[in-house]
Structure formats: structure tokens, C-alpha cells
């Protein structure tokens, strides 16, 4: 990871979005066996820490406040140049976190698309943000930033993300900063989990006893593939959590997983996706919809023994 | 409605300490920073810094450092500010102002520091 | 610090007469310029922020216009209430600095 031509590339680990009192490393990538360096800030509210210091692989600073966010750049050792030190790097900023309150983050036309849509991610909060920032859980580079457009005591931002392809799935979550401080960010909204599917073969949804039952008779619904996903997920039509359960491996080579829905009391359109560990927010296509018909009496609800999976958490493994 | 009330006019002796308050309704405090600005007799406008209602960080500018302090009281929505060892050039009006741009203002506090 | 040049320190204006107010920046401020309106004994009152969005209940006479270092406020139609101090405030970087202010007298 060179930045070419004499100039050494300044990185940042985890991220360049760091929390108030959290901690980043900051690394200096310059010639192989020049591993010091040294590591200023641009503008006027320096880190006085850096003055003189020189640094050896990676610098960890913190616990972070207001003062570390902008612009940082380092220089490579060079013994033998004129000034003893490289071209200065690539500018990296760091945004501190934490310093507002937060935004709402919401998805239209909502937060599973198929391979290939697009998604808008709306930024909102009645915090007079001048900039809002998009940024992906993992991911190390700079968030996207948009002007905040205002109306009716609401500024907002709205990001367009797409066509989706699977390395854009993954959990979101959106920031504000005020104009006098561009990279002191507030705290983050809720997280909100972008998934994609219709990159793998369907599971097939399967009801036991059967898909038309007596009010108060116990049904579990049955998700099963000949590919070996490792999770599977059960969406209800007008719902807007699923419920998820770990793949077991049956005796016939399928792998399967059974969703107790406890006693029936009224019906409903379930589909079933499956994923992979290594990829949580990367789903099948759906299954075919099973129509789930109650006789008898039905009430408002379905009580739920298999605990929901809030708004966010689907891109989260199954420990 | 956004409203920002100041306290009443302070008569001081230099050395003393005055605390201005500037009580904010009409909105969720901690969504705007608060600014404070200072009118001295005759002179125009000048930004003394800002407290960030959300994490209690106060800024000044270079020539507030030192006597100035901020402070809040969040479950009363009100901001403070704090002058120690008043001089006869902190005579002026102080008015506190809030959000980034400064949308509203308070009415304004007389401090008047004589012998 | 980004200094704010205002012009000019003072004038006159009849009544329904278009008035402009200048205000220069030391660096470029984007479009992160505020316009104040003092009376005395009265709080200040925001007019524009942004350079030109006009602030809720504030008179459509008023518009503001500008971004990079100038910028101006227009009063279309000059009426008795718009008499007072005029102020313009940079808020792009710390510390904010104001103008120094134009006093506008009906002739």
C-alpha cells in the first residue's frame, strides 16, 4: 500500500469514524523497512502530543475528544534526503462521533431489495444539520456526505445506494455536523441493516401439520435447501421484523430449520430466505409464499414463542 | 413558541463575579448549541464561543479565555455564563443566541462593572 | 481569523427606496453568512441565514444573496420599521466573526 512517488500512505484502523473517548490507529505505510514516521494535523486545533514525536508501524490515539477530529497527514523516514523526511501523505480525516444527538435513518422502499435494485437511505433530525454522513459498518474509507436540505424545522439527506450488489449490503448508520465543525459528527442513529436478496437457489417453506389448521393448534413452519446455508430467516407479509434460527443439517443432506409459531390464531403469507455465516445481510431468493389459513375463531394476533429480531441485527452473526 | 429569556441587569464592582442565565423554551435544548455574544456601549457585535448543549463542551474565542466560563443546567434548559473578576471593560450587554447560525436571541443582559 | 468587512458604516435611505448591504469575507466562508438586524433596547433578529434563506416571519423585502467571500442584503422596498443596526456574521469557522455593522436612518 504505497501513495507513490516518495509519498507515504496514512491510513486509519478500524476507522476513520471514531467515537468520543474511543480509540484509532493511525498507520504510516511507507517503504519497506522505513517503519518511522511522524504525524501532524492541519488545521489550527493541533494535537500537541505529535510535536517531535516520531512514531514506529502505527500511532494509537486516544481516547479521542472534539480536538482530534480533521485533517491528519504523515511523512516517511528518509535518512538520507536533504530534510531526512518524504513528501507529506494523503490527507486522512478523522470524525469524531458523539457530539450531537442523534438522526433517524430510514430506507425507502425499505431495507430488503432484490440484487440490483436501489435503495434511498433518508437521514432526518430536527438537529439543524448542515451535512449528514452515510457510513457502513467495516468499512475503513471515508462516509458519504451530503448537504442537509431544510423544511419545516426537518433537515434532511437522502442517499442513493445501488444498483445493490452484495458488497453493499451490510449495517448503516447515518450522522449530522453542524458547519463550524464539519468532522465532529453527532452521535450515531440506530443502525439500520441493508440486505439483499435473490443471490442464491430458494429454500422451500413447508407447514407441519399443514398450511390450514384449527384456531389454537400448534404449527411450526419448516425452511429447507440442499445448499447448506447456515441461518434461516422467516418473514411474515406485513411485518417488519423477521424471525431467524441456525440451519441443522438433517440426515437427508438437507439443511433445515423449524419455526415454532405456538398456537394459531389467525393467518398469514410467510416466505423463507436463506444466508451464509460469512455473509449475514446477503440472503437466497425468497421461497415460494405459503399461505398459512386458520379455521375456527381468529383473533388480532399470533403470539410468538421464536423471539423477533429487532429493526437492526440481521447483518449480526448467530453466536 | 422559541423563546430565550435572560436575566435582569447586574450592577458589579470590579474583581466580583457576575452569572448571567438564559433560560431557552419552545424547543429540545440539547438539539442547538448555545452561543453568547457580547455588546459593548457603542460598539458592535463581538462572538465570545459557544457550549454544545448535548456534551456540555464549551469553546471561547481567543479573547473570552481564562475569566469566561459556560455552563448548563439541562434539566432547567438554561445556559450560563459566568464572568470572574470583573473588569470595567466587561461593560456591556450580553445576549445568548442560539443554534449554528444563530436564529434566536435572548433580549440581553446589562452588566455594568463601576467603583 | 476569517475577518468580515462590512459596508458602509452608515447610511440614509428614503421609504420605498431598495437598499443593499455589503459584506465581505477575509477567505472564502461558502455560503455560511447570517444577517442580523439591531434596535435598540430590542433582541437581535435573525433575517437570513445561509447567505439567502430567509428566516420564518421574516418580510419577503428582505433577500440575501452571495457565496465564496461576498455577499449583500437587499431590502426591496425601504419601509419606517427596517430602520436600525445591520449586522453580518461568518460561521464557517471558528471563532464566528461578525461585521461591524450598518447603521440605516430613514432620510
Known amino acids: 500500500l504505497m501513495g507513490g512517488q516518495d509519498k507515504p500512505f496514512l491510513s486509519a484502523r478500524p476507522s476513520t469514524v471514531v467515537p468520543r473517548g474511543g480509540h484509532v490507529a493511525l498507520q504510516c505505510h511507507y517503504r519497506r523497512g522505513f517503519n518511522n514516521f511522524m504525524l501532524y494535523k492541519e488545521d489550527r486545533s493541533h494535537v500537541p502530543i505529535f510535536h517531535g514525536r516520531i512514531f514506529q508501524e502505527s500511532f494509537i490515539m486516544g481516547p479521542v475528544t472534539t480536538a482530534h477530529a480533521g485533517t491528519y497527514r504523515c511523512r516517511g523516514s528518509r535518512p538520507h534526503s536533504l530534510t531526512g523526511w518524504s513528501a507529506p501523505s494523503n490527507p486522512l480525516v478523522i470524525m469524531v462521533t458523539g457530539n450531537h444527538r442523534k438522526p433517524s435513518l430510514l430506507a425507502h422502499p425499505g431495507p430488503l431489495l432484490k440484487s440490483g435494485e436501489t435503495v434511498i437511505l433518508q437521514c432526518w433530525s430536527d438537529v439543524m444539520f448542515e451535512h449528514f454522513f452515510l457510513h457502513r459498518e467495516g468499512i475503513s474509507e471515508d462516509p458519504s456526505r451530503l448537504v442537509g436540505q431544510i423544511h419545516d424545522g426537518v433537515s434532511k439527506a437522502n442517499f442513493s445506494i445501488g444498483p445493490l450488489m452484495p458488497v453493499l449490503a451490510g449495517t448503516y448508520r447515518c450522522y449530522g455536523s453542524v458547519p463550524h465543525s464539519p468532522y465532529q459528527l453527532s452521535a450515531p442513529s440506530d443502525p439500520l441493516d441493508i440486505v439483499i436478496t435473490g443471490l442464491y437457489e430458494k429454500p422451500s417453506l413447508s407447514a407441519q401439520p399443514g398450511p390450514t389448521v384449527q384456531a389454537g393448534e400448534n404449527v411450526t413452519l419448516s425452511c429447507s435447501s440442499w445448499s447448506s446455508y447456515d441461518i434461516y430467516h422467516l418473514s411474515r407479509e406485513g411485518e417488519a421484523h423477521e424471525r431467524r434460527l441456525r440451519a441443522v443439517p438433517k440426515v437427508n443432506r438437507t439443511f433445515q430449520a423449524d419455526f415454532p409459531l405456538g398456537p394459531a390464531t389467525h393467518g398469514g403469507t410467510y416466505r423463507c430466505f436463506g444466508s451464509f455465516r460469512a455473509l449475514p445481510c446477503v440472503w437466497s431468493n425468497s421461497s415460494d409464499p405459503l399461505l398459512v389459513s386458520v379455521t375456527g375463531n381468529p383473533s388480532s394476533s399470533w403470539p410468538s414463542p421464536t423471539e423477533p429480531s429487532s429493526k437492526s441485527g440481521i447483518c449480526r452473526h448467530l453466536h | 413558541q422559541i423563546q430565550l429569556v435572560q436575566s435582569g441587569p447586574e450592577l458589579k464592582n470590579p474583581g466580583e463575579t457576575v452569572k448571567i442565565s438564559c433560560k431557552a423554551s419552545?424547543?429540545?435544548?440539547?438539539?442547538?448549541?448555545m452561543n453568547w455574544v457580547k455588546q459593548a456601549p457603542g460598539k458592535g457585535l463581538k462572538w465570545m464561543g459557544w457550549?454544545?448543549?448535548?456534551?456540555?463542551?464549551?469553546t471561547y474565542a481567543d479573547d473570552f479565555k481564562g475569566r469566561f466560563a459556560f455552563s448548563l443546567e439541562t434539566s432547567a434548559s438554561t445556559a450560563y455564563l459566568q464572568i470572574n473578576n470583573l473588569k470595567n471593560e466587561d461593560t456591556a450587554t450580553y445576549f445568548c443566541?442560539?443554534?449554528?447560525?444563530?436564529?434566536?436571541w435572548g433580549q440581553g443582559t446589562l452588566v455594568t462593572v463601576s467603583t | 481569523d476569517i475577518k468580515m468587512t462590512q459596508s458602509p458604516s452608515s447610511m440614509y435611505a428614503s421609504l420605498g427606496e431598495r437598499v443593499t448591504i455589503t459584506c465581505k469575507a477575509s477567505?472564502?466562508?461558502?455560503?455560511?453568512l447570517s444577517w442580523f438586524q439591531l434596535k435598540p433596547g430590542k433582541s437581535p433578529k435573525t433575517l437570513i441565514y445561509?447567505?439567502?434563506r430567509l428566516v420564518d416571519g421574516v418580510p419577503s423585502r428582505f433577500s440575501g444573496s452571495g457565496s465564496g467571500q461576498d455577499f449583500s442584503l437587499t431590502i426591496s422596498s425601504l419601509e419606517c420599521e427596517d430602520m436600525g443596526i445591520y449586522y453580518c456574521?461568518?460561521?464557517?469557522?471558528?471563532?464566528?466573526?461578525f461585521g461591524g455593522g450598518t447603521t440605516l436612518e430613514i432620510k
Open positions: 443566541a442560539h443554534g449554528p447560525w444563530l436564529a434566536y
Open positions: 419552545g424547543y429540545i435544548f440539547t438539539n442547538y448549541g
Open positions: 457550549i454544545n448543549t448535548y456534551t456540555g463542551e464549551p
Open positions: 477567505q472564502d466562508i461558502n455560503s455560511y
Open positions: 445561509r447567505a439567502n
Open positions: 456574521l461568518q460561521y464557517d469557522e471558528l471563532p464566528y466573526t
